[in-house]
Amino acid sequence: ASVATELRCQCLQTLQGIHPKNIQSVNVKSPGPHCAQTEVIATLKNGRKACLNPASPIVKKIIEKMLNSDKSN
């Protein structure tokens, strides 16, 4: 991908809710020169990607659970 493509936010919008069972992994991108806000990008079990609302309590729980399962593996 070109540098121009990468230096921008990757989330067009955010899903307000998603069932954790559909999520394979979660990538939390901190704010930086490419994007002013935190982005939570979930890889779904069907191979698609989805952006989640980092302020959502459900999403916070999902991130916490994923990070904990990563630590235990």
Partner: antibody, heavy 121, light 111 residues
Framework: QIQLVQSGPELKKPGETVKISCKGS????????MHWVKQAPGKGLKWMGW????????TYADDFKGRFAFSLETSASTAYLQINNLKNEDTATYFC??????????????WGQGTLVSVSA | DIVLTQSPASLAVSLGQRATISCKAS??????????MNWYQQKPGQPPKLLIY???NLESGIPATFSGSGSGTDFTLNIHPVEEEDAATYYC?????????FGAGTKLELK
């Protein structure tokens, strides 16, 4: 089930304005971006741009800046495409398509049935 | 803009045979390990139907007679075996960057 239903065909004269609608159902309308695609008779597909259904912010492809406007009525789960000062070359079928939330989206799985706009004096 | 060049513009294939359609992008559509190339089928009077997303993933409800492959700039849609209802126009589309672009289309006819 997820559906996008568009308004019916329109016959207009050059210089007039047309506004076509696309109503989403079966999903949370404000979760997903909405895109518009033009197909002139017997031709291929051309992406016109998209509207953020959370914020209402539109993004237009270069060829569709100026006379074209995307808008929303979120309470009715409906997106609109308005074309001002119609020209003969605007004669086409216009499709709405539900996009994703990730910039590198994986294609449009849901489309409206299309709205034919015919422009003729 | 990323230009997508489809070939051939049209092809005629016998029932049960293989149809192969190529799509070449003017620059890479890869990002973060994925290739953002999608394939659609369109029949007259109907909207396009998504067949393949992210180069090789079969959309839900699409028969396994359709498959996609490729990365970077070179992509292929295969249909095997070709069935009667596959007569249509096929488009590739990149979703790597704005403006999103489509190939000019390949018309598949049955011999």
């Amino acid at each position: 089930q997820i559906q996008l239903v568009q308004s019916g065909p329109e016959l207009k004269k050059p210089g007039e304005t047309v506004k076509i609608s696309c109503k989403g159902s079966g999903y949370t309308f404000t979760d997903y971006s909405m895109h518009w695609v033009k197909q002139a008779p017997g031709k291929g597909l051309k992406w016109m741009g998209w509207i953020n259904t959370e914020t209402g912010e539109p993004t237009y492809a270069d060829d569709f800046k100026g006379r074209f406007a995307f808008s929303l009525e979120t309470s009715a789960s409906t997106a609109y495409l308005q074309i001002n000062n119609l020209k003969n070359e605007d004669t086409a079928t216009y499709f709405c398509a539900r996009g994703g939330v990730y910039r590198y989206d994986e294609g449009f799985a849901y489309w409206g049935q299309g709205t034919l706009v015919s422009v003729s004096a | 803009d990323i230009v997508l060049t489809q070939s051939p513009a049209s092809l005629a294939v016998s029932l049960g045979q293989r149809a192969t359609i190529s799509c070449k992008a003017s620059q890479s559509v890869d990002y973060d390990g994925d290739s953002y190339m999608n394939w659609y089928q369109q029949k007259p009077g109907q909207p396009p139907k998504l067949l393949i997303y992210a180069a090789s993933n079969l959309e839900s409800g699409i028969p396994a007679t359709f498959s996609g492959s490729g990365s970077g700039t070179d992509f292929t849609l295969n249909i095997h075996p070709v069935e009667e209802e596959d007569a249509a126009t096929y488009y590739c589309q990149q979703s790597h960057e704005d403006p999103l672009t489509f190939g000019a289309g390949t018309k598949l006819e049955l011999k």
